[in-house]
């Protein structure tokens, strides 16, 4: 698995370099996670034909994956920094159970799946430091998450492959929207 941002040897060997600002660190962290998702998607697409499946076939699923909407204030029209930041953090917290589900879904990219999960936890911490209104952030209920995880793991093979594909696709879209929004902050 690639080395997480801020831990490569070049950083250590270049003391003259300016330390990253909070925004730069967040930006770098998101891009690192997106790289990890690309690697995982590659394995998923090689293993099954999910990536070629029609949008209609994939649309019908019981997954309630976080998604950016107009009301979240993350798009250029109606942009609202505080509302958007709360949405990004809340969404990432909601994705955590799905990232946990991904942990046993990869054979050759097992470390990569773990790296995506751990890096997301770090990203959440970075963003929580940036947020002023932490009270507005709702944390998912652990019991609900545990039961959701059990339910997802009980699915047949085809549904598990579809779930894996949908999680990766949605997480990628969510992070891309978050990255665009955070660059406006």
């Amino acid at each position: 698995a690639p080395v997480p941002p801020g831990e490569d040897s070049k950083d250590v060997a270049a003391p003259h370099r300016q330390p990253l600002t909070s925004s730069e660190r967040i930006d770098k962290q998101i891009r690192y996670i997106l790289d990890g998702i690309s690697a995982l998607r590659k394995e998923t697409c090689n293993k099954s034909n999910m990536c070629e499946s029609s949008k209609e076939a994939l649309a019908e699923n019981n997954l309630n994956l976080p998604k950016m909407a107009e009301k979240d204030g993350c798009f250029q029209s109606g942009f609202n920094e505080e509302t958007c930041l709360v949405k990004i953090i809340t969404g990432l917290l909601e994705f955590e159970v799905y990232l946990e589900y991904l942990q046993n879904r990869f054979e050759s990219s097992e470390e990569q799946a773990r790296a995506v999960q751990m890096s997301t936890k770090v990203l959440i911490q970075f963003l929580q430091k940036k947020a002023k209104n932490l009270d507005a952030i709702t944390t998912p209920d652990p019991t609900t998450n545990a039961s959701l995880l059990t339910k997802l793991q009980a699915q047949n093979q085809w549904l598990q492959d579809m779930t894996t594909h949908l999680i990766l696709r949605s997480f990628k879209e969510f992070l891309q929207s978050s990255l665009r929004a955070l660059r406006q902050m």
Partner: antibody, heavy 120, light 107 residues
Framework: EVQILETGGGLVKPGGSLRLSCATS????????MNWVRQAPGKGLEWLAQ??????????YYAESLEGRVTVSRDDAKNSVYLQVSSLRAEDTAIYYC???????????WGQGVMVTVSS | DIQMTQSPASLSASLEEIVTITCQAS??????LSWYQQKPGRTPQLLIQ???NLADGVPSRFSGRRFGTQFSLTISTPQVEDTGVYYC?????????FGTGTQLEIK
């Protein structure tokens, strides 16, 4: 050609236990989930247990009605799956089928079944 | 666990009649439902997979449909050899569950 053969049936006393074996050939056993289904005389089909493969951490699932009395296992080297049932009662008398699940979850291949009779 | 309610328990039909058997799932199972035919003393045979796909070698008079959590198996022009017991199976999530079965007699 896919072949599934169940063995280990016969007459068992109430309170006893049994271990059914299911030997398979003609397909890559490691790729598939295997299931056990039973049918009591004159009754309907009852799904009993599922044994997943290595990619799915050898997960096991059981019908609620049998939970605690049944254990499923597999031996990839022997292309075989096993069903252990304990504390047997008269109502466990049935034909026990070993089945191979498809990628989509439905049962695509069935063994011929093995008869288990629980009686004193 | 997901419950499957199958109806009717039995029915008798003539050669010209259209036969429909239904299965109702207690929760959403998507398209993960299959139909089986069993004749006396024989192992069950797969008829329909994933709600509406005909299994290999199954005559086209058999068809499956899905309406949300309700599924139906239709035999458009039943033949005498279609006499037997029909079962649905939900294979969305383990533990899987069969319907109670429908005894069909074609006169």
């Amino acid at each position: 050609e896919v072949q599934i053969l169940e063995t280990g049936g016969g007459l068992v006393k109430p309170g006893g236990s049994l271990r059914l074996s299911c030997a398979t050939s003609g397909f890559n056993f490691n790729d598939y989930f295997m299931n056990w289904v039973r049918q009591a005389p004159g009754k309907g089909l009852e799904w009993l247990a599922q044994m997943r493969n290595k990619n799915y951490q050898y997960g096991t699932y059981y019908a609620e009605s049998l939970e605690g009395r049944v254990t499923v296992s597999r031996d990839d080297a022997k292309n075989s799956v096993y069903l252990q049932v304990s504390s047997l009662r008269a109502e466990d008398t049935a034909i026990y089928y070993c089945t191979r699940e498809s990628y989509y979850g439905f049962t695509s291949y069935w063994g011929q079944g093995v008869m288990v009779t629980v009686s004193s | 666990d997901i419950q499957m309610t199958q109806s009717p328990a039995s029915l008798s039909a003539s050669l010209e009649e259209i036969v429909t058997i239904t299965c109702q799932a207690s929760q959403d199972i998507g398209i993960s439902l299959s139909w089986y035919q069993q004749k006396p003393g024989r192992t069950p045979q797969l008829l329909i997979q994933n709600a509406n796909n005909l299994a290999d070698g199954v005559p086209s008079r058999f068809s499956g449909r899905r309406f949300g959590t309700q599924f139906s198996l239709t035999i458009s022009t039943p033949q005498v050899e279609d006499t037997g017991v029909y079962y649905c199976l939900q294979h969305n999530s383990a533990p899987y569950t069969f319907g109670t079965g429908t005894q069909l007699e074609i006169k």
